[in-house]
């Protein structure tokens, strides 16, 4: 799998999409997980509804939400109020029993807010009371890592 880069602006929302073959993964729940190091496990962040037929319903864990268009074959993850610590490697997964297939490898990059010269008091940080539906979703910039680029830079 190539890694697709999604860039979002700090404080705003980022939408990550993972297309898949809807028939190949028919009946399978999906998940979004965070890769812990190059060889480490992928730690589950959020998964779609326990009942596959209700996968279109948005499920959330903290500031991350997931919804699945099972007919169209697109898994969508929304990271709200993007923060620097959200940057990193993730995977979209298709679940089959205790197995997981990788649908897409994703690198989330968080860009500095161009308005961060303002006072902190002027910054809008979505509160828990505000729903995902109300949150502004920035059209994410995405690209695949170029050949030769290292997805996990070596640690010194």
């Amino acid at each position: 799998h190539n890694t697709t880069v999604f860039q979002g602006v700090e404080g705003q929302s980022l939408q990550v999409s993972c297309p898949y073959d809807s028939m190949k993964h028919w009946g399978r729940r999906k998940a979004w997980c965070r890769q812990l190091g190059e060889k480490g496990p992928c730690q589950r962040v959020v998964s779609t509804h326990n009942l596959w037929l209700l996968s279109f319903l948005r499920r959330r864990n903290g500031s991350t939400a997931i919804t699945d268009d099972t007919l169209g074959g697109t898994l969508t993850i929304t990271l709200r109020n993007l923060q620097p610590h959200d940057a990193g490697f993730y995977q979209c997964q298709s679940l089959h029993g205790s197995e997981a297939d990788t649908l897409r490898k994703v690198l989330v990059e968080v860009l500095a807010d161009p308005l961060d010269h303002r006072d902190a008091g002027d910054l809008w940080v979505p509160g828990e009371s505000e729903s995902f539906e109300d949150a502004h979703v920035e059209h994410s910039i995405s690209r695949s890592l170029l050949e030769g680029e290292i997805p996990f830079p070596p640690t010194s």
Epitope: D21, M23, K24
Partner: antibody, heavy 122, light 108 residues
Framework: EVQLVQSGAEVKKPGESLKISCKGS????????IGWVRQMPGKGLEWMGI????????RYSPSFQGQVTISADKSISTAYLQWSTLKASDTAIYYC???????????????WGQGTMVTVSS | EFVLTQSPGTLSLSPGERATLSCRAS???????LAWYQQKPGQAPRLLIY???SRATGIPDRFSGSGSGTDFTLTISRLEPEDFAVYYC?????????FGRGTRLDIK
């Protein structure tokens, strides 16, 4: 009618190669996983591996990895199981079967081929 | 890999009697991923039960499946002459997919 029709019985010598087939009809062949199952004489069922004809994604049981090759030609709705070097211990009936796509439980084999008897003897 | 142990190995009963076949897994299986098959001599297996308890299309209601976790049961409420065959359980919760060794149901 939804069915899987397998190629006929084969008699081979050890060391020879073989490719058996499984042709699907009556449904969208590219939309269902196809599995292969071995049944040695008088024994039970052993899962060998599966293939998704839509993109030829293939998974093997560790017991059969490197021993056989599973492939598919979606243009003629046919899956294949092949050996490059047969052994006497490969003598068995080989079944192809379709994975059902029941929501929340995809994976049971709902449609089976009639089986192909492979005899390997010198 | 998941090991499925079926018992008894052979069950001898008469038509009209009730048959209870057991399948025990070495690890917990999600009920959604357990199936039962029937195989008669010279024939391919036939799917009877999926998701541990759901009957496949065209399967008579005398066949029922139950269980969860590691213990699963196939029950044939009233045996008909055509029910005497070999029965296999199968898990597809984890790769590799595995089958039990089978229970042979013989006419007494």
């Amino acid at each position: 009618e939804v069915q899987l029709v397998q190629s006929g019985a084969e008699v081979k010598k050890p060391g020879e190669s073989l490719k058996i087939s499984c042709k699907g009809s009556g449904y969208s062949f590219t939309s269902y996983w196809i599995g292969w199952v071995r049944q040695m004489p008088g024994k039970g069922l052993e899962w060998m591996g599966i293939i998704y004809p839509g993109d030829s994604d293939t998974r093997y049981s560790p017991s059969f990895q490197g021993q056989v090759t599973i492939s598919a030609d979606k243009s003629i709705s046919t899956a294949y199981l092949q050996w490059s070097t047969l052994k006497a211990s490969d003598t068995a009936i080989y079944y192809c079967a379709r994975h059902d796509i029941i929501p929340a439980a995809p994976g049971a084999f709902d449609i089976w081929g009639q089986g192909t008897m492979v005899t390997v003897s010198s | 890999e998941f090991v499925l142990t079926q018992s008894p190995g052979t069950l001898s009963l008469s038509p009209g009697e009730r048959a209870t076949l057991s399948c025990r897994a070495s690890q917990i299986i999600s009920s959604n991923y357990l199936a039962w098959y029937q195989q008669k001599p010279g024939q391919a297996p036939r799917l009877l039960i999926y998701s541990a308890s759901s009957r496949a299309t065209g399967i008579p209601d005398r066949f029922s499946g139950s269980g969860s976790g590691t213990d699963f049961t196939l029950t044939i409420s009233r045996l008909e002459p055509e029910d005497f065959a070999v029965y296999y359980c199968q898990q597809f919760d984890s790769s590799p997919i595995t089958f039990g060794r089978g229970t042979r149901l013989d006419i007494k």
